[in-house]
Interface confidence: low
């Protein structure tokens, strides 16, 4: 099994606590308002804690239509969120899973940095192409910025 690691850092003028609340704790209610149409549907199995599954269907027309996320850990004190992508065509047929570690770091100006470390566990010696990483980063950035704009407005 291969392992690839990618880091995405996004800065925000919104505080780490507020981003964490919207991005992690209240994501299921905030995201549909912040980015309507980002998801076609979300089916939640579980209570929101570790082990909870989110079966996500994305809008038609994109390269990815399905993904299943498993919540691995939410630490409100440390502002960390761990989750894994464990199923769906997002895995491209050669990725076993994508382990994600998100941490919100407060900055001196009252804003925050959202640092996501994504660890791709691939089958055999398969390598995730750079264009796929770039696409994922663009989607995640767009989603984050939509969420940030919503939190600033509300």
């Amino acid at each position: 099994m291969g392992v690839q690691t990618h880091v995405l850092e996004l800065t925000s003028s919104v505080s780490a606590e507020k981003i964490f609340q919207g991005f992690v704790i209240d994501v299921d209610t905030v995201l549909p308002k912040a980015a309507p149409g980002a998801y076609k549907s979300v089916e939640i199995k579980g209570d929101g804690g570790p082990g909870t599954l989110k079966i996500i269907t994305l809008p038609d027309g994109g390269p990815i239509t399905t993904m299943t996320l498993r919540i691995d850990g939410v630490n409100k004190e440390a502002l960390t969120f761990d989750y894994s992508v464990i199923d769906g065509d997002i895995l491209l047929g050669f990725i076993e899973s994508i382990e994600n570690h998100v941490v919100l770091v407060p900055t001196a100006d009252g804003g925050s940095i959202c640092k996501t470390t994504a660890i791709f566990h691939t089958k055999g010696d398969a390598v995730v192409p750079e264009e796929n990483i770039k696409y994922a980063n663009e989607q995640n950035t767009a989603l984050f910025k939509a969420l940030e704009a919503y939190l600033i407005a509300n």
């Epitope: 690691t5 880091v7 850990g73 004190e77 440390a78 761990d82 770091v105 640092k115 660890i119």
Partner: antibody
Framework: QVQLVQSGAEVKKPGASVKVSCKAS????????MHWVRQAPGQGLEWMGW????????NYGQKFQGRVTMTRDTSITTAYMELSRLRSDDTAVYYC?????????????WGQGTLVTVSS | DIQMTQSPSSLSASVGDRVTISCRAS??????LNWYQQKPGKAPKLLIY???NLQSGAPSRFSGSGSGTDFTLTISSLEPEDFATYYC?????????FGQGTKVEIK
């Protein structure tokens, strides 16, 4: 102040297992990942894996997968590293090391080390 | 895996000397580079994290610079307690890997 206190030196035979403990104090145990790093005599440092002390989730270096098990007991703020099917080249000092903030994979605090000698 | 190569592997210097140690990564690791000091029989100690941030409690004579693939640890004026082995470590991509170490000895 932050302290990581490891269990004492061990001598093991090839094929046996060893379990090293790391008792943490002086901080919120579940707020920081714990890593294990080893150092063979006269050699450099080698990362073995981490445990998310909050969830118990682990990530092992590929070299050690199938032989290493990392666990924790939050009630006594202690992390454990067990290495099985020991070989002579596993002779090393084993360190636990705590992440600097949450988990940014910077090893801020280290245990004093546990020497594991594998010899027949 | 990302290979970390330090140079030199050892150096001799005198108290008061300015010392620089280099660390090169086999691929771009942005600023995810950390430096540790280790004395014989002791655990490593964090000196610099994420290329240029001085760890709390580390003396200000230590500084770090660089990004991408090339990094430097500088000791502005060597003190007797600085004779030790120094390791760089990348925290960009699993597995986290260390350089082979640079031993700073008394001339």
């Amino acid at each position: 102040q932050v302290q990581l206190v490891q269990s004492g030196a061990e001598v093991k035979k090839p094929g046996a297992s060893v379990k090293v403990s790391c008792k943490a104090s002086g901080y919120t145990f579940a707020a920081h990942y714990m890593h294990w790093v080893r150092q063979a005599p006269g050699q450099g440092l080698e990362w073995m894996g981490w445990i998310n002390t909050y969830t118990g989730g682990t990530n092992y270096g590929q070299k050690f997968q199938g032989r290493v098990t990392m666990t924790r007991d939050t009630s006594i703020t202690t992390a454990y590293m067990e290495l099985s099917r020991l070989r002579s080249d596993d002779t090393a000092v084993y360190y636990c090391a705590r992440d600097r903030r949450n988990w940014n994979f910077v090893f801020e605090y280290w245990g004093q080390g546990t020497l594991v000698t594998v010899s027949s | 895996d990302i290979q970390m190569t330090q140079s030199p592997s050892s150096l001799s210097a005198s108290v008061g000397d300015r010392v620089t140690i280099s660390c090169r990564a086999s691929q771009n690791i942005k600023n995810y580079l950390n430096w540790y000091q280790q004395k014989p029989g002791k655990a490593p100690k964090l000196l610099i994290y994420e290329a240029s941030n001085l760890q709390s409690g580390a003396p200000s004579r230590f500084s770090g610079s660089g990004s991408g693939t090339d990094f430097t640890l500088t000791i502005s004026s060597l003190e007797p307690e600085d004779f030790a082995t120094y390791y760089c470590q990348q925290s960009f991509s699993i597995p986290w890997t260390f350089g082979q170490g640079t031993k700073v000895e008394i001339k």
